[in-house]
């Protein structure tokens, strides 16, 4: 079948990085500069994407693959193939219709993008709050309140992250 197809359509023999040139008796011609074809049998090459302005080149265009862009510092990619760059906020904030706003009490965001999320409810796991939450950080849950009672007989030392005077990483 492949042989039959190629006899009927000489363009099917043109590999990625070339196009089937109708002006030159359907021979396979290399893609011109700043263009590419990512599949074989193409009758034209696609224009390379140019990463300009807020968009930075993450991967250069080649004869067989398009350029890939990301965003300049202060922005992050949105959309398929980084079609847009959304502005960052600070940790402890979220982007709303009115701009970057601090997380409400009881919520946090440890990234420069995304939304504020509620602090973990330690009591749901039968634990107590070891380190309070902030706008930038979730709470750290510790042992259950019963484990901390004066009569507790456990002699197992706490995990390093729970040592007094050390903040968890």
């Amino acid at each position: 079948f492949e042989r039959t197809r190629s006899l009927q359509d000489p363009c099917s023999n043109c590999p990625a990085g070339t196009f089937c040139d109708n002006n030159r008796n359907q021979i396979c011609s290399p893609c011109p500069p700043n263009s590419f074809s990512s599949a074989g049998g193409q009758r034209t090459c696609d224009i390379c994407r140019q990463c300009k302005g807020v968009f930075r080149t993450r991967k250069e265009c080649s004869s067989t693959s398009n350029a890939e862009c990301d965003c300049t510092p202060g922005f992050h990619c949105l959309g398929a193939g980084c079609s847009m760059c959304e502005q960052d906020c600070k940790q402890g904030q979220e982007l709303t219709k009115k701009g970057c706003k601090d997380c409400c009490f009881g919520t946090f965001n440890d990234q420069k993008r995304g939304i504020c999320r509620p602090w973990t409810n330690c009591s749901l796991d039968g634990k107590s709050v070891l380190v309070n939450g902030t706008k930038e950080r979730d709470v750290v849950c510790g042992p259950s309140p019963a484990d901390l009672s004066p009569g507790a007989s456990s002699v197992t030392p706490p995990a390093p992250a729970r040592e007094p005077g050390h903040s968890p990483q």
């Epitope: 968009f55 202060g74 079609s83 847009m84 959304e86 502005q87 009115k98 701009g99």
Partner: nanobody
Framework: QVQLVESGGGLVQPGGSLRLSCSAS????????MSWVRQAPGKGLEWVSD????????FYEDSVKGRFTISRDNAKNTLYLQMNSLRAEDTAVYYC?????????????????WGQGTLVTVSS
């Protein structure tokens, strides 16, 4: 409804200056990035410059860097393009355009509203 109205174009000698304005209405101007795009006679659209919603981040096409300055006055809902050291190749219709999402800079294909354009002719 969204409206973008450019003004300030005209005939200027090489080396001269012009300041384009774009008056915006019908949306919360201060929440959207804005752009200038131009079209030279017989050519396609060419991106010129972007400015983010707050005005602190600006971006330029290489050929206009150091000569053009984009700015905005969110209190007046107005976008500007200060054009200095103008060259014959800057002759074009200049359009202002609005980006589609708040606090986001898009590619030119995704701009959702455009003005009617103002003609800039650089000639001696």
């Amino acid at each position: 409804q969204v409206q973008l109205v450019e003004s300030g174009g005209g005939l200027v000698q090489p080396g001269g200056s012009l300041r384009l304005s774009c008056s915006a209405s019908g949306f919360t101007f201060s929440s959207y990035a804005m752009s200038w795009v131009r079209q030279a006679p017989g050519k396609g659209l060419e991106w010129v410059s972007d400015i983010n919603s707050g005005g602190e981040s600006t971006f330029y096409e290489d050929s206009v860097k150091g000569r053009f300055t984009i700015s905005r006055d969110n209190a007046k809902n107005t976008l500007y393009l200060q054009m200095n050291s103008l060259r014959a190749e800057d002759t074009a219709v200049y359009y202002c355009a609005k980006h589609p999402l708040t606090f986001t800079i898009a590619t030119m294909n995704d701009y959702d509203y455009w003005g009617q354009g103002t003609l800039v002719t650089v000639s001696s």
